[in-house]
């Protein structure tokens, strides 16, 4: 498998972590989240060429079959391999609470 | 979130489990796998419209940001939520061995 940064399509074009700034309004959270007002959303974006950051055997199979049957089998997709937690201050029936979300921000990425 | 089978794009067009028949040659395994000669590969294929089989909060965020910035943020992607193990009979330096692979066949799918 190629090194995670050795993108055959050119620097930065393959599956990697990107940060997208989003407001509560952008996320549709304005009615239930108080803080933060803006989130630096880390997400996985980019192409998954052959064996690039292949998550597992399934990703390798997908690559092989996509090469054979590109109209039937999609190429592997760039998705989070793990997440960073994030604490939101949210509105509740009784007032306000602190809540940790485990699956909100991507921590690192792979192809699957 | 919509029910897993309630695809707004039409029956069977959204993220779900598909079976693709593949030979060892198709998979590039002919030189190291003896059996099975053919694999019924289960994989996740299909579109991920808004909130369809959203895996977690991250998938929901991705949907919202894709709607706002379709050229920057891709839509969620249909990937395995879990796997079924599979036993391969493989060639080794000393002969033949049985090996279980845990991450080869998709068991069910979600959008992320």
């Amino acid at each position: 498998a190629r090194n995670g940064d050795d993108c055959p399509l050119g620097p930065g074009r393959c599956c990697r972590l990107h940060t997208v700034r989003a407001s509560l309004e952008d996320l549709g959270w304005a009615d239930w989240v108080l803080s933060p007002r803006e989130v630096q959303v880390t997400m996985c974006i980019g192409a998954c060429p052959s064996q690039f950051r292949a998550a597992n055997m399934h990703a390798q199979i997908k690559t092989s079959l996509h090469r054979l049957k590109p109209d039937t089998v999609p190429a592997p997709c760039c998705v989070p391999a793990s997440y960073n937690p994030m604490v939101l201050i949210q509105k509740t029936d009784t007032g306000v609470s602190l809540q940790t979300y485990d699956d909100l921000l991507a921590k690192d990425c792979h192809c699957i | 979130a919509r029910n897993g089978d309630d695809c707004p794009l039409g029956p069977g067009r959204c993220c779900r489990l598909h079976t693709v028949r593949a030979s060892l040659e198709d998979l590039g395994w002919a030189d190291w796998v003896l059996s099975p000669r053919e694999v019924q590969v289960t994989m996740c294929i299909g579109a991920c419209p808004s909130q369809f089989r959203a895996a977690n909060m991250h998938a929901q965020i991705k949907t919202s940001l894709h709607r706002l910035k379709p050229d920057t943020v891709p839509a969620p992607c249909c990937v395995p939520a879990s796997y079924n193990p599979m036993v391969l009979i493989q060639k080794t330096d000393t002969g033949v061995s049985l090996q279980t692979y845990d991450d080869l066949l998709a068991k069910d799918c979600h959008c992320i």
């Epitope: 108080l34 803080s35 937690p85 604490v87 201050i89 306000v96 609470s97 602190l98 809540q99 940790t100 485990d102 | -």
Partner: antibody, heavy 118, light 107 residues
Framework: DVKLVESGEGLVKPGGSLKLSCAAS????????MSWVRQTPEKRLEWVAY????????FYADTVKGRFTISRDNARNTLYLQMSSLKSEDTAMYYC???????????WGQGTLVTVSA | SIVMTQTPKFLPVSAGDRVTMTCKAS??????VAWYQQKPGQSPKLLIY???NRYTGVPDRFTGSGSGTDFTFTISSVQVEDLAVYFC?????????FGAGTKLELK
């Protein structure tokens, strides 16, 4: 090095008031949420109050709500806990803690003892 | 609020022993559990956060595991300096709550 130093300990009568302070150094105080955590004589740990980095959101344990007030002065790098209508069950060692953004307590002061007794 | 039930209350040990203590949350808290060590006369010290992540400088004999409602804290080979009280804490939602503690004492 992160340093948190509590002060204000004392013996107070039930119904009385006391103000605790926590002087912070070794980090950018205004960037971190802070909490007060107390430890009872039976050695039970109880979270008391939490304040966000800018002081815009505040949370209290139900046992102290309406009686205790957490505040901060970012210019002075100091965290406060104003305690009033004190009860004997408020007797505890009070610790100032720094939150690293995930609601666990990464740094603790040495503690300051509050005794509520007639 | 979420109740953290810690067992056992006391754990008699000898140097070199492998010891395990558990913490059970009254509702699902994901991986949001921390473990602290408190030695006599000292303030608590963070050892493990997010169920299994060792905090900076914490020796690898200390490990945490679990998710959902059941969590475990293990010391693979107890050293004399590990004699202390260990507390679990849920950092999932407010009010933040602690277990009652497990005291490690010499047999």
């Amino acid at each position: 090095d992160v340093k948190l130093v509590e002060s204000g300990e004392g013996l107070v009568k039930p119904g009385g008031s006391l103000k605790l302070s926590c002087a912070a150094s070794g980090f950018t105080f205004s960037s971190f949420a802070m909490s007060w955590v107390r430890q009872t004589p039976e050695k039970r740990l109880e979270w008391v109050a939490y304040i966000t980095s800018g002081g815009d959101y505040i949370f209290y344990a139900d046992t102290v709500k309406g009686r205790f007030t957490i505040s901060r002065d970012n210019a002075r790098n100091t965290l406060y806990l104003q305690m009033s209508s004190l009860k004997s069950e408020d007797t505890a060692m009070y610790y100032c803690t720094r939150d690293d953004g995930y609601l666990w307590f990464a740094y603790w002061g040495q503690g300051t003892l509050v005794t509520v007794s007639a | 609020s979420i109740v953290m039930t810690q067992t056992p209350k006391f754990l008699p040990v000898s140097a070199g022993d492998r010891v395990t203590m558990t913490c059970k949350a009254s509702q699902n808290v994901g991986n949001n559990v921390a473990w602290y060590q408190q030695k006599p006369g000292q303030s608590p010290k963070l050892l493990i956060y997010y169920a299994s992540n060792r905090y900076t400088g914490v020796p690898d004999r200390f490990t945490g595991s679990g998710s959902g409602t059941d969590f475990t804290f293990t010391i693979s080979s107890v050293q004399v300096e590990d004699l202390a009280v260990y507390f679990c804490q849920q950092h999932y939602s407010s009010p933040l709550t602690f277990g009652a503690g497990t005291k490690l004492e010499l047999k």
